[in-house]
Interface confidence: low
């Protein structure tokens, strides 16, 4: 099926940028792995590079505004022509759910005290308003609550005194039209406007002040424009050469609004000054190699010795990594393929252990399934041997610093009937539903 092809994929937002055009196949669009595509306008944007997990979304709002609730976040497998870790197809969502608490307590309403006395009238003549107030402290609200209703109320009051009314101008009326719309007529154009002393009129008893200034205003019409000329398009110019050496590109034609040029405020040409076409080099773009993550450290050994495990004898170990994905003369991976270090082997060594403190609570599992729970653990942690800071080696090797390697066998006193791990579980509360955020936007 044809897709919309874009020149950029924005990792931070997951959006396609720089529309190249539509009506091309996914395979043609993804000749350049820096490109991205959409199956329909406004649909999910997928980059052409090999699939990998997006960043986790921000945590959704807590499912309740007070007391303990839960919140979700998600990430999506994005890319083309492959799978994300865990053999997951592009477009698939993965969820995490955790406990949350925006506010420990829930708001409680308060009660009003009695009304206070009325304040004086707001005016000294005619009618005004007066106000009285009450306090929200009977009892006081808790945890951000409030009292229902208003803290003050007002009522009309009459001073039994007549107020004088001073005159004020109403707004100016419109200017009368000028006698011509373009400059160069037989008479000098003039425009006039007027206003009334009616907003309000001054009172007679008690006497109010009249409006200051003039009721009429006249002026010459200046700066009338010459009559406008609308612009017109010239012919389309030549098509530009295809600007890329691999994948799809975009060529362009241009035209100029000069046939004629717009004059004296006449409108500019309607329509576009440029138009574009897709050009296809049919050449795949180079793909640079990328290092896989480091492999596991090899077993800690020492040449000419069968085993050094559980002994104060240092050995060596190495790990490697693979340069993957290099195609079409892309760059090779930079850096070393192998890493070497010195080590003490404590593989399968029985060591005295001690119980750790409780870990922090883990995520709610399953995030989208029924009855998710969270857990925390105490682990039997091995006490590593306290070897001296310098270790005497064979002739010519000197004293070496080493890294402990291997999985020891810690021994702890039994705790709640367990020897290695003690776990505590708790249900997650007020769990929201998992919904695809792309479907929510439609």
């Amino acid at each position: 099926d044809p897709v919309l092809c874009f020149t950029q994929y924005e990792e931070s937002s997951g959006k396609c940028k720089g529309l190249l055009g539509g009506g091309v196949s996914v395979e043609d669009c993804c000749l350049n792995t820096a490109f991205a595509y959409q199956k329909r306008s406004g649909g999910l944007c997928q980059p052409c590079r090999s699939p990998r997990w997006s960043l986790w979304s921000t945590w959704a709002p807590c499912s309740v505004t007070c007391s303990e609730g839960s919140q979700l976040r998600y990430r999506r497998c994005v890319g083309w022509n492959g799978q994300c870790s865990g053999k997951v197809a592009p477009g698939t969502l993965e969820w995490q759910l955790q406990a949350c608490e925006d506010q420990q307590c829930c708001p409680e309403m308060g009660g009003w005290s009695g009304w206070g006395p009325w304040e004086p009238c707001s005016v000294t003549c005619s009618k005004g308003t007066r106000t009285r107030r009450r306090a929200c402290n009977h009892p006081a609200p808790k945890c951000g609550g409030h009292c229902p209703g208003q803290a003050q109320e007002s009522e009309a009051c009459d001073t039994q005194q007549v107020c004088p009314t001073h005159g004020a101008w109403a707004t100016w009326g419109p200017w009368t039209p000028c006698s011509a719309s373009c400059h160069g007529g037989p008479h000098e154009p003039k425009e006039t406007r007027s206003r009334k002393c009616s907003a309000p009129e001054p009172s007679q008893k008690p006497p109010g002040k009249p409006c200051p200034g003039l009721a009429y205003e006249q002026r010459r019409c200046t700066g009338l424009p010459p009559c406008p000329v609308a612009g017109g398009w010239g012919p389309w110019g030549p098509v530009s050469p295809c600007p890329v050496t691999c994948g799809l590109g975009q060529t362009m034609e241009q035209r100029t609004c000069n046939h004629p040029v717009p004059q004296h405020g006449g409108p500019f040409c309607a329509g576009d000054a440029t138009r574009t076409h897709i050009c296809n080099t049919a050449v795949p773009c180079p793909v640079d190699g990328e290092w896989d993550s480091w492999g596991e450290w090899s077993p800690c050994i020492r040449r000419n010795m069968k085993s050094i495990s559980c002994q104060e004898i240092p050995g060596q170990q190495s790990r490697g990594r693979t340069c993957r994905g290099r195609k079409f003369d892309g760059h090779r991976c930079a850096g070393q393929q192998q890493d070497i270090r010195h080590c003490y082997s404590i593989q399968h060594c029985p060591l005295k252990g001690s119980w750790s403190e409780w870990s922090t609570w883990g995520l709610c599992m399953p995030p989208c399934g029924p009855n998710p729970t969270r857990a925390r653990q105490r682990l039997c942690t091995p006490l590593l041997p306290k070897y001296p800071p310098t270790v005497s080696m064979v002739e010519g090797q000197g004293e070496k610093n080493v890294t402990f390697w291997g999985r020891p066998l810690p021994r702890c006193e039994e705790l709640q009937g367990q020897k290695l791990v003690v776990e505590e579980k708790r249900p997650c509360l007020h769990v929201p539903a998992c919904k695809d955020p792309e479907e929510e936007e439609l």
Partner: nanobody, 119 residues
Framework: QVQLVESGGGLRQTGESLRLSCTAS????????MAWYRQAPGKQRELVAE???????TYADSVKGRFTISRDSAKNTVTLQMNSLKSEDTAVYYC?????????????WGQGTQVTVSG
């Protein structure tokens, strides 16, 4: 972290002397061992000389009696005095530092300085 900077490399004739110096910065109070390694073209990197925090030294058989390693804790430097140089001493010489405690260790390397012995 510990940063190491070597100096003093250069070109010498057979039988002449050269003094390499390595200055350490960062968390140098945790360094237990300091050493000089070298790597000739097409060969594995090999230990030349090593000195512990308490002054114990170790030398490769090929340099015993000709090279001397010393450490100045006040200036955070380790030096390698190379006398009676031979053509087989031609290599890139690297300064090395080891941090170590009962929970494990870390190893740090300088960028290297070229020593060429001709004749």
């Amino acid at each position: 972290q510990v940063q190491l900077v070597e100096s003093g490399g250069g070109l010498r004739q057979t039988g002449e002397s050269l003094r390499l110096s390595c200055t350490a910065s960062g968390r140098i109070f945790e360094v237990n061992m300091m050493a000089w390694y070298r790597q000739a073209p097409g060969k594995q990197r090999e230990l030349v000389a090593e000195i512990s925090r308490v002054g114990t030294t170790t030398y490769a058989d090929s340099v015993k009696g000709r090279f001397t390693i010393s450490r100045d804790s006040a200036k955070n430097t380790v030096t390698l005095q190379m006398n009676s140089l031979k053509s087989e001493d031609t290599a890139v010489y690297y300064c090395n530092a080891l941090q170590y405690d009962r929970y494990g260790g870390a190893e740090y390397w300088g960028q290297g300085t070229q020593v060429t012995v001709s004749g």
